[in-house]
């Protein structure tokens, strides 16, 4: 009898293993987006950039879900936030109208069902790219871990983005769900 | 009957608790590893460091391998990558050549099956670094969220690398994984 | 007989899975405190920063103490800990004492057992912020994994702590368990 | 080939003025960071000042500061050295040298032109 | 400031022979930013090696360095008549630059 009972159990133990291992991943949502240079705005001015690769190169996604340039949390729980922007410029780009600048990225959080944006993270410097050197080159890294509950949802806004880098390796950002709400 | 099964029951549970919790210990690969000053190569070129510690002060490593200046992934997974390089320079450390530089950091993913290199991650300044003052400092920090297969090696590549800071607060990079792949 | 420890297996396998559940999201430690603006020492020397929010906006903390201006860690485990900090001066502010600084954050941890505080990461720059223009801002961002043991301090030094942007967005820091000590 | 001509030496009295100069050519002078190596007759060699590429940023021997100005006219491909409140001890061939551009510091000397003297004397 | 001793002051060989000149720093160079010259008489002086270990363009092979932290040394293996000379040491790893006083290596 005894035998029957453990053999029936390391059965009924392997699937609920696999079931587990199986939401376990289906529980931690990811996403990894990366600048879509085909659509960058012009201007000086704080925007928000909406274009943004998910699926090609280092861009992916799961359990998540990009949307009308935003992030969408499908999934309650702590995620930890991420964003590098680079930003530069060749003189054979042309002269930049200012050599003061102010190269800023903000990561904010909308909710939906209360309408209104928050910035989660900020940074940036004010920069003095002079006509003296030919190449000029900045980057932003920006970091934390925020409750972020279904529905709300994750865009980036800069200034200046007429100068970001449209590498893939220059200009993205990311998150990934760390743990569950208690 | 029923006793008997049940106390077999919590018996076994435990041991797979015991089992499942160790191998979950073991699963979770990472790395942190801190700049080995005593072999940073010269010149202003991007070059590829490879001494790094990984034994020593914060420096650590856990079901991942470092050989021949790379990191090398052990387990298929979805991994945080993180790098901080530090940039300084002392009037005593000897006289600038340029004060126009470009302090620069590449995280790079190599695969040994289809010899290709690609860079992660990039991030840095161009830099005014004036002959008129006495000390100048500069650190870049980058982060992303990548799928990485075992085999995969990690590197890292600076400009300028004689100006690193060679403090293991300053100048590190690592990675921790954080899921499966599906 | 098989069908009612079947039956009797699957609720104790489901309330042992809620237990599990349950003390994995206990068994997970994280803060992200925000600077208190109110507190603020002045000076250009280097300082520890006191005065951080645990409980409002952004900020929050959970198997984690905060107590004299220093997080406590009251799990061992590796943890992810980042920084962000920002500085910024306006005209309106006053004139700056001097146009060259040195505007750093320092990453430390104290152990109490062995009363001594080492610095785990730092990074910043050196910034000439000249009277020509009106507004200047910089942000800083570390991260890196750490094992850290139940007792042990993290806290934040800066330099220009007169300088530093007192919103939640800008200057903060935070630390997340990722896993446990083997 | 890179060369380097010095010129502009000659004998003056202590507390005069000399102005050196240094034709370049054979290379992009403005790339390059440039210094003034002199060596007093029958003695070893003593690095005297240093100019970046641009002109930038210049570094002087603590035994000529605040006599001594270096300088440069990257559109005439030449560097100059105004030595003023001249000395004794400040008698020496001066040799203009190029660096090498391959390292963010200044480093070795390579090449030198063929020397400049310079006599200061009553 | 690093202050760089040469050893011997003055060397006597032969053509044929090796020579190996000395170069010691008064505090550790730093990343072996040491380079080495051969000046004869009249002349400027010529770089031989940079890094010190790096041969510069042209050098012959016969001419080679080592070392670090504060011992050098340059090796000539075998002598040619033209090598008799006065040869230097530069140190470019800490401001000022400095030059040791120098070996003359001169015919025995």
């Known amino acids: 009898g005894s035998q029957h009972i453990r053999a029936e159990k390391a059965m009924v133990d392997g699937s609920w293993l696999d079931l587990a291992k199986r939401s376990k991943l289906e529980a931690q949502p990811f996403a990894h987006l990366t600048i879509n240079a085909t659509d960058i705005p012009s201007g000086s001015h704080k925007v928000s950039l909406s274009s943004w690769y998910h699926d090609r190169g280092w861009a992916k996604i799961s359990n998540m879900t990009f949307s009308n340039g935003k992030l969408i949390v499908n999934q309650d729980g702590f995620y930890y936030l991420y964003a590098n922007i680079c930003f530069r410029h060749h003189e054979t780009s042309g002269d930049l109208a200012t050599e003061y600048l102010q190269l800023m990225v903000y990561v904010t959080k909308t909710s939906i069902k209360i309408p209104s944006s928050h910035t989660l993270m900020k940074g940036g410097s004010t920069k003095y790219w002079s006509g003296n050197s030919e190449f000029h080159f900045y980057s932003i890294n920006v970091g934390g871990f925020f409750k972020l509950r279904s529905g709300e949802e994750i865009s980036i806004e800069v200034s200046n983005p007429s100068l970001l880098d449209p590498d893939q390796d220059a200009t993205y950002f990311g998150a990934f769900k760390v743990r569950d709400i208690d | 009957g029923s006793q008997h099964i049940r106390a077999e029951k919590a018996m076994v549970d435990g041991s797979w608790l015991d089992l499942a919790k160790r191998s979950k210990l073991e699963a979770q690969p990472f790395a942190h590893l801190t700049i080995n000053a005593t072999d940073i190569p010269s010149g202003s070129h991007k070059v590829s460091l490879s001494s790094w510690y990984h034994d020593r002060g914060w420096a650590k490593i856990s079901n991942m391998t470092f050989s021949n200046g790379k990191l090398i992934v052990n387990q298929d997974g979805f991994y945080y990558l993180y790098a901080n390089i530090c940039f300084r320079h002392h009037e005593t450390s000897g006289d600038l050549a340029t004060e126009y530089l470009q302090l620069m950091v590449y995280v790079t993913k190599t695969s040994i099956k289809i010899p290709s290199s690609h860079t992660l991650m990039k991030g840095g300044s161009t830099k005014y670094w004036s002959g008129n003052s006495e000390f100048h400092f500069y650190s870049i920090n980058v982060g992303g969220f990548f799928k990485l297969r075992s085999g995969e090696e990690i590197s890292i590549e600076v400009s300028n690398p004689s100006l690193l800071d060679p403090d293991q607060d300053a100048t590190y990079f690592g990675a921790f994984k954080v899921r499966d792949i599906d | 007989g098989s069908q009612h420890i079947r039956a009797e297996k699957a609720m104790v396998d489901g309330s042992w899975l809620d237990l599990a559940k349950r003390s994995k999201l206990e068994a997970q430690p994280f803060a992200h405190l925000t600077i208190n603006a109110t507190d603020i020492p002045s000076g250009s020397h280097k300082v520890s920063l006191s005065s951080w929010y645990h409980d409002r906006g952004w900020a929050k903390i959970s198997n984690m103490t905060f107590s004299n201006g220093k997080l406590i860690v009251n799990q061992d485990g590796f943890y992810y800990l980042y920084a962000n900090i920002c500085f910024r001066h306006h005209e309106t502010s006053g004139d700056l004492a001097t146009e060259y600084l040195q505007l750093m954050v320092y990453v430390t941890k104290t152990s109490i057992k062995i009363p001594s505080s080492h610095t785990l990461m730092k990074g910043g720059s050196t910034k000439y912020w000249s009277g020509n223009s009106e507004f200047h801002f910089y942000s800083i961002n570390v991260g890196g994994f750490f094992k850290l043991r139940s007792g042990e301090e993290i806290s934040i030094e800066v330099s220009n702590p007169s300088l530093l942007d007192p919103d939640q967005d800008a200057t903060y820091f935070g630390a997340f368990k990722v896993r446990d000590i083997d | 080939e890179v060369q380097l001509l010095e010129s502009g030496g000659g004998l003056v009295q202590p507390g005069g003025s000399l102005r050196l100069s240094c034709a370049a050519s054979?290379?992009?002078?403005?790339?390059?960071?440039m210094s003034w190596v002199r060596q007093a007759p029958g003695k070893g060699l003593e690095w005297v000042s240093g100019?970046?590429?641009?002109?930038?940023?210049?570094y002087y021997a603590d035994s000529v500061k605040g006599r001594f100005t270096i300088s440069r006219d990257n559109s005439k491909n030449t560097l100059y050295l105004q030595m003023n409140s001249l000395r004794a001890e400040d008698t020496a061939v001066y040799y203009c040298?190029?660096?090498?551009?391959?390292?963010?510091?200044?480093?070795?000397?390579?090449?030198w032109g063929q020397g400049t003297l310079v006599t200061v004397s009553s | 400031e690093i202050v760089l001793t040469q050893s011997p002051g003055t060397l006597s060989l032969s053509p044929g022979e090796r020579a190996t000149l000395s170069c010691r720093a008064s505090q550790s160079v730093r990343g072996r930013y040491l380079a080495w010259y051969q000046q004869k008489p009249g002349q400027a002086p010529r770089l031989l090696i940079y890094?010190?270990?790096s041969r510069a363009t042209g050098i012959p092979d016969r001419f080679s360095g080592s070392g670090s932290g504060t011992d050098f040394t340059l090796t000539i293996s075998r002598l040619e008549p033209e090598d008799f000379a006065v040869f230097y040491c530069?140190?470019?790893?800490?401001?000022?630059?400095?030059f040791g006083q120098g070996t003359k290596v001169e015919i025995k």
């Open positions: 890094g010190a270990s």
């Open positions: 040298a190029k660096d090498p551009g391959t390292t963010v510091i200044m480093s070795w000397f390579d090449p």
């Open positions: 530069q140190q470019y790893g800490s401001s000022p630059r400095t």
């Open positions: 054979g290379f992009t002078f403005s790339s390059y960071a």
């Open positions: 100019i970046t590429g641009s002109g930038g940023s210049t």
